[in-house]
């Protein structure tokens, strides 16, 4: 049985300065183009190499953009959201929601990012205990000789 996948949600304010080729990312979503089921929010679908967003480093593909320069992105048509970014000016403030994947459930059934799925301490503690028991047994054995 696989573990349940949960998400740790964090929010961040990201201030970008429009570069020579713009802000440097793509978006999906909107009321007419839901990217996530039952969610008409706006999501980052692509970050352009060497663009303003990539050079800043904080915005990630998959992030949900909540607002642009204080303007809420809820219940917007896709194209209206695109236009909002294009008309946002030179300095652009983004309120962003990051979703970090967290694994819950049985050990050994984790995602591709961790093939073994076993935390290091789960290996080290038994090994340390076994070593201690072996050392104690060896000492007892030597005393009996």
């Amino acid at each position: 049985m696989n573990g349940r996948v949960d998400y740790l949600v964090t929010e961040e304010e990201i201030n970008l300065t429009r570069g020579p080729s713009g802000l440097g990312f793509n978006i999906v979503g909107g009321t007419d183009q839901q990217y996530v089921s039952n969610d008409s929010g706006i999501y980052v679908s692509r970050i352009k190499e060497n663009g303003a967003a990539a050079l800043d480093g904080r915005l990630q593909e998959g992030d949900k953009i909540l607002s642009v320069n204080g303007q809420d992105l809820k219940n917007l048509l896709h194209q209206d959201a695109v236009d909002l970014f294009r008309n946002a000016g030179y300095a652009v403030s983004l309120r962003v929601q990051h979703r970090l994947q967290v694994q819950n459930g049985p050990i050994g059934h984790r995602g591709e990012g961790d093939p073994s799925g076993i935390p290091i301490f789960m290996v080290l503690v038994p090994v340390f205990a076994l070593t201690m028991v072996a050392a104690w047994a060896f000492m007892r054995y030597r005393q009996q000789l």
Epitope: G24, N26, I27, V28, Q33, R46, G51, H78, Q79, V82
Partner: nanobody, 125 residues
Framework: DVQLVESGGGLVQAGGSLRLSCAAS????????MAWFRQGPGKEREFVAT????????YYADSVKGRFTISRDNAKNTVYLQMNSLKPEDTAVYYC???????????????????WGQGTQVTVS
């Protein structure tokens, strides 16, 4: 990711028409912004036309406005370029391009696109 294959190029007389097709393989084609670029002999690759996710957000280069029409069929994972009133200066290799989602910057720039086809030759005599 998406793979793009262009077809429909050929030799045509000035004033004639051609219809180029770009077949895309991959998931979520309807979420891609699609475009056509061209590269004439000894020239830089230049923007021709682009279409947004649901046949909206259409832009054309000034040199082709009124003569070329870009469209897409999301059910067939295909984008088209209908070229009418062709001129000798339209001679070029025509490339299909794609990017996932909508660029928040200009979609007319070559750098906005991540995926490219191999191109199809159009020669106007």
């Amino acid at each position: 990711d998406v793979q793009l294959v262009e077809s429909g190029g050929g030799l045509v007389q000035a004033g004639g028409s051609l219809r180029l097709s770009c077949a895309a393989s991959g998931r979520a084609f309807d979420r891609y912004t699609m475009a056509w670029f061209r590269q004439g002999p000894g020239k830089e690759r230049e923007f021709v036309a682009t279409v947004g996710w649901n046949d909206n957000s259409i832009y054309y280069a000034d040199s082709v406005k009124g003569r070329f029409t870009i469209s897409r069929d999301n059910a067939k994972n295909t984008v088209y370029l209908q070229m009418n009133s062709l001129k000798p200066e339209d001679t070029a290799v025509y490339y299909c391009a794609a990017t996932f989602g909508s660029p928040v910057d200009t979609p007319l720039d070559r750098g906005a696109y991540d995926f490219w086809g191999q191109g199809t030759q159009v020669t106007v005599s």
